[in-house]
């Protein structure tokens, strides 16, 4: 695989964001051995792009079979293609692995988009550009699927990094990360830096480009600027968090904060868009439309169905507002905000008809299953999934796409009262999400 090849990104991308310096937290914890510092071997171990997912190279079986695996914080099964499929260049061949053990049990997983069926087993798994360990993990061998594998995405399986509660067929199937932590000395934490390119990539560019980093067992300081701010994981199933306020260009949406988390809010690397509950989506779009009213866009654009294009290099970023999500802080009555730019929520896409133009899709969409902070949000930030301390950290990503006038931001603290009331108490069902 090609690592460390960076495509030239447009208009001052990468490095420290310009402009506003973020305040440092005064009560930052002392360094913990093994948890922070440099993880050189894991930096740049992800490839892909937001529309088709970010993947890491993994090996399965003995002798090792190399596969590219989608990193999905919105599900909890480790599953790999295990039969020929038109969209797969390679697949897991159980019969060639001397360490494969059949669990004699089937599994079915429906996502927001796509479904698959498979057979459960265990085998030895490692991550070449990850910790130097091998673990015996549960594997779902995908034998049949529909609308799951993506033509040209270059991944052959999925690594569900959420908790056992949403694993299929039930919570007794230990997820990969739980097995990793149990069987090794890897700390119970991982962090993700997803790097959106800021312009569409063709197949050869994707193969050569770096998509970001998954740091397993720690935090790499080179991947972010400013401070990390943490929000509690409300419940260990999805990575569920609580949004307490939403602003568009600094204007409060002024909704009952329960609406923002109806019926949950999750951080999900396996979903492309920022997905918002119906009422919130409608209010947000109304506000974004008003802020960007110097140009008129067709209704299909706001529904994520139509592209808008500008002559190369002339995208009017300044007419689009920034979006701020305020998240519950770790301290009572304290919140912090994460702010994304249009460079995150307008997703670059190739328009065959006008390849000399810069074309975009609106990457905020409506949801009937709560707020999903997908790749378009995560591409602005370095996100720490601190499972050990039941919290998720956000800092400005060193690779986020921005311009000379504005940058993504993570700022706090803010005083916010009655934040517990913002959470919705969902009747218990189990669901999974993936790239929509």
């Amino acid at each position: 695989t090609q690592h460390g090849i960076r495509l030239p990104l447009r208009s001052g991308l990468g490095g420290a964001p310009l402009g506003l310096r973020l305040p440092r937290e005064t009560d930052e914890e002392p360094e913990e051995p093994g948890r922070r510092g440099s993880f050189v071997e894991m930096v740049d171990n992800l490839r892909g792009k937001s529309g088709q997912g970010y993947y890491v190279e993994m090996t399965v079986g003995s002798p090792p079979q190399t596969l590219n695996i989608l990193v999905d914080t919105g599900s909890s099964n480790f599953a790999v293609g295990a039969a020929p499929h038109p969209f797969l260049h390679r697949y897991y061949q159980r019969q060639l692995s001397s360490t494969y053990r059949d669990l004699r049990k089937g599994v079915y997983v429906p996502y927001t988009q796509g479904k698959w069926e498979g057979e459960l087993g265990t085998d030895l798994v490692s991550i070449p550009h990850g910790p130097n360990v091998t673990v015996r993990a549960n594997i779902a061998a995908i034998t049949e699927s529909d609308k799951f594998f993506i033509n040209g995405s270059n991944w052959e399986g999925i690594l569900g990094l959420a908790y056992a509660e949403i694993a299929r067929p039930d919570d007794s199937l230990e997820p990969f990360f739980d097995s990793l932590v149990k069987q090794t000395h890897v700390p119970n934490l991982f962090s993700l830096q997803l790097c959106g390119a800021g312009f569409p990539l063709n197949q050869s560019e994707v193969l050569a480009s770096v998509g970001g980093s998954m740091i397993i067992g720690g935090i790499d300081h080179s991947l972010y600027t400013g401070s990390l701010w943490y929000t509690p994981i409300r419940r260990e199933w999805y990575y569920e968090v609580i949004i307490v306020r939403v602003e568009i260009n600094g204007q409060d949406l002024k909704m009952d904060c329960k609406e923002y988390n109806y019926d949950k809010s999750i951080v999900d690397s396996g979903t492309t868009n920022l997905r918002l509950p119906k009422k919130v989506f409608e209010a947000a779009v109304k506000s974004i439309k008003a802020a960007s009213s110097t140009e008129k866009f067709p209704d299909g654009f706001w529904l994520g169905e139509q592209l808008v294009c500008w002559q190369a290099g002339t995208t009017p970023w300044n007419i689009f507002p920034v979006i701020s999500l305020y998240l519950m802080g770790e301290v009572t009555n304290q919140s912090f905000r994460i702010t994304i730019l249009p460079q995150q929520y307008l997703r670059p896409v190739e328009d065959v008809a006008t390849s000399q133009d810069d074309c975009y899709k609106f990457a905020i969409s409506q949801s009937s299953t709560g707020t999903v902070m997908g790749a378009v949000i995560m591409e602005g930030f370095y996100v720490v999934f601190d499972r050990a301390r039941k919290r998720i950290g956000f800092a400005v990503s060193a690779c986020h796409v921005h311009d000379e006038f504005r940058t993504a931001a993570v700022e706090g603290p803010f005083v916010t009262l009655d934040m517990e009331d913002c959470g919705y108490n969902i009747p218990q069902t189990d669901e999974s999400t993936l790239m929509t």
């Epitope: 988009q113 479904k115 069926e117 034998t143 529909d146």
Partner: antibody, heavy 118, light 112 residues
Framework: EIQLQQSGAELVMPGSSVKLSCTAS????????IHWLKQRTEQGLEWIGK????????KYAPKFQDKATITADTSSNTAYLQLSRLTSEDTAVYYC???????????WGQGTTVTVSS | DIQMTQTPLSLPVSLGDQASISCRSS???????????LHWYLQKPGQSPKLLIY???NRFSGVPDRFSGSGSGTDFTLKISRVEAEDLGVYFC?????????FGAGTKLELK
């Protein structure tokens, strides 16, 4: 308990249309595929088509392409089969059934008898 | 469309007997993914069909182990090792390798 509850028997006039329903309980139809099948007395089973309620995508047997329309409403967890331009050949029991990706029918509705007669 | 031919159309048995039903397809049912999508159903009088065997030889949950499926390519067999009263009814084979899905005409398992 997983169940597919179909609407009641229909006696309809030739040339008219009829819409049958199939309401699921114990699971969400958005997570599965809902198929419709036809069984005429002494004539075995025929597959009409299916819907993926998650996105509304449908597939039909060529024979039923112009006869049947399958729809679904995830909010009410219900799938529908509309049959148009009815003739005596459409007199049959119609079943809805559920599948995962592999098209094996693991749960079936109780069937709806449609009688086309003037 | 794929033709599914079942034999016999009627199978008279005594309780405790072994029963064997054959199903032949007009084309191979091996999918490009290597799997074979041949399934067996039982329909009792006045009821909906019920799944017994899927993908040639896999028993559906709750199906007694006296039912077994075998075969490959175009030739498949359903065996009942010791027929019980509750096994009586019409057995259908079905293929879902090719669109449209098709069924055999059925085999009626009845008492002698």
């Amino acid at each position: 308990e997983i169940q597919l509850q179909q609407s009641g028997a229909e006696l309809v006039m030739p040339g008219s249309s009829v819409k049958l329903s199939c309401t699921a309980s114990g699971f969400s139809i958005a997570d599965y595929y809902i198929h419709w099948l036809k069984q005429r007395t002494e004539q075995g089973l025929e597959w009409i088509g299916k819907i993926d309620p998650a996105d509304g995508e449908t597939k039909y047997a060529p024979k039923f392409q112009d006869k049947a329309t399958i729809t679904a409403d995830t909010s009410s967890n219900t799938a529908y089969l509309q049959l148009s331009r009815l003739t005596s050949e459409d007199t049959a029991v119609y079943y809805c059934a559920r599948t995962m990706v592999v098209e094996r029918f693991d749960y079936w509705g109780q069937g709806t008898t449609v009688t086309v007669s003037s | 469309d794929i033709q599914m031919t079942q034999t016999p159309l009627s199978l008279p048995v005594s309780l405790g007997d072994q029963a064997s039903i054959s199903c032949r397809s007009s084309q191979s049912l091996v999918h490009s993914n290597g799997n074979t999508y041949l399934h067996w159903y039982l329909q009792k009088p006045g009821q909906s069909p019920k799944l017994l065997i899927y993908k040639v030889s896999n028993r559906f949950s709750g199906v007694p182990d006296r039912f077994s499926g075998s075969g490959s390519g175009t030739d498949f067999t359903l065996k009942i090792s010791r027929v019980e009263a509750e096994d009586l009814g019409v057995y259908f084979c079905s293929q879902s390798t090719h669109v449209p899905l098709t069924f055999g005409a059925g085999t009626k398992l009845e008492l002698k």
